[in-house]
């Protein structure tokens, strides 16, 4: 039976350019974690595997950093990096547990700024 | 270098048994999943069985299950497919492979022929 | 059992071509489908895994795209040594199965 909840930092937002820590954290059961997979939108992120360590997908390796422990760390971010994001918590017995992120990247307060105090 | 060297194969009657090896080398055996996969003479490709590395948990195709049984001995970086109550249509070169992340199979062994025949 | 349906199964083609190979899964399989080249009295050599990513090694005219049930396999300029039989997997659930495969042939 599985008694295990995932909780998840919920709905972000970020800047533009800067970078955000997606955390996921699995409660209320002795299951063994033994891989993290880390996705967005039907592709894969990275992958934390109990023996293997981490793994980063080639097309993200330059903008994606792994940790906070079990956690991913997304850089340089893009208005295209608005989305769910879902950390699958693969686990021995209990099976995989789900979590759900929803990133919003919003324009820099700078580039706000700017468009609103433009002089006339 | 990752070497995958898979043994055992041969010529059996139907109803016989086989246990095939794989002796692995140039990485940390114990820490990746590993699976058997067949390929009938001028056939594609059948997954047979896998074993994850920590918890050794196994899964089987149902062509095979209840006759085949995978096991590992991480301490002799080898794995095993004991077959039992082969049949005709068990005829293949059996390939020994690894499953890094559980998700992609990233080398393969050379294989080892299966003949079941009277 | 999550079938995968690979097409063509064969096809003719010239050092240069651009070709196209797809695998489609009978139910939603996010990105877990990866691709194998085959050549004759050879082991499978991964190519392309988790639906995009290239295999360390394997050469750049290789690429990979889709996601949920239909993948492509892309040759952006056939080689003569890139002849050869190629199949999709699945690895989203147990039993992994795999397409029937697709022989690329000199035309």
């Known amino acids: 039976m599985m008694t295990g909840t995932i909780e998840t930092t919920g709905n972000i937002s970020a800047e533009k350019g800067g970078s955000i820590i997606l955390q996921c954290h699995l409660s209320s059961t002795t299951a063994q974690v033994t891989q993290v997979n880390w996705e967005q939108q039907d592709q894969l992120l990275a992958i934390c595997n109990a023996d293997l360590g981490w793994h980063i997908s080639p097309s993200f390796k330059d903008r994606v950093a792994p940790g906070p422990g079990l956690g991913l760390t997304l850089q340089s971010l893009t208005v295209n990096d608005t989305g769910e994001y879902f950390c699958i918590y693969h686990t021995y017995p209990d099976g995989t547990y789900t979590g759900r992120i929803f990133l919003e990247v919003l324009e820099s307060s700078v580039a706000e700024h700017g468009a609103r105090f433009q002089i006339p | 270098e990752v070497q995958l060297l898979e043994s055992g194969g041969g010529l059996v009657q139907p109803g016989g048994s086989l246990r095939l090896s794989c002796a692995a080398s140039?990485?940390?055996?114990?820490?990746?999943?590993m699976s058997w996969v067949r390929q009938a003479p001028g056939k594609g490709l059948e997954w047979v069985s896998d074993?994850?590395?920590?918890?050794?948990?196994?899964s089987y195709a149902d062509s095979v299950k209840g006759r085949f049984t995978i096991s590992r001995d991480n301490s002799k970086n080898t794995l095993y497919l004991q077959m039992n109550s082969l049949r005709a249509e068990d005829t293949a070169v059996y390939y020994c492979?690894?499953?890094?992340?559980?998700?992609?199979?990233?080398?393969w062994g050379q294989g080892t022929l299966v003949t079941v025949s009277s | 059992d999550i079938q995968m349906t690979q097409s063509p199964s064969s096809l003719s083609a010239s050092v240069g071509d651009r070709v196209t190979i797809t695998c489609r899964a009978s139910?939603?399989?996010?990105?877990?489908v990866n691709w194998y080249q085959q050549k004759p009295g050879k082991a499978p050599k991964l190519l392309i895994y988790?639906?995009?990513s290239l295999q360390s090694g394997v050469p750049s005219r290789f690429s990979g795209s889709g996601s949920g049930t239909d993948f492509t396999l892309t040759i952006s300029s056939l080689q003569p040594e890139d002849f050869a039989t190629y199949y999709c997997?699945?690895?989203?659930?147990?039993?992994?199965?795999f397409g029937g495969g697709t022989k690329v042939e000199i035309k």
């Open positions: 988790a639906a995009s």
């Open positions: 997997q699945q690895s989203y659930s147990t039993p992994l199965t």
């Open positions: 492979a690894r499953v890094p992340y559980s998700v992609w199979i990233d080398y």
């Open positions: 140039g990485f940390t055996f114990s820490s990746y999943a």
């Open positions: 139910q939603s399989i996010s990105y877990y």
């Open positions: 074993i994850k590395s920590s918890a050794g948990s196994t």
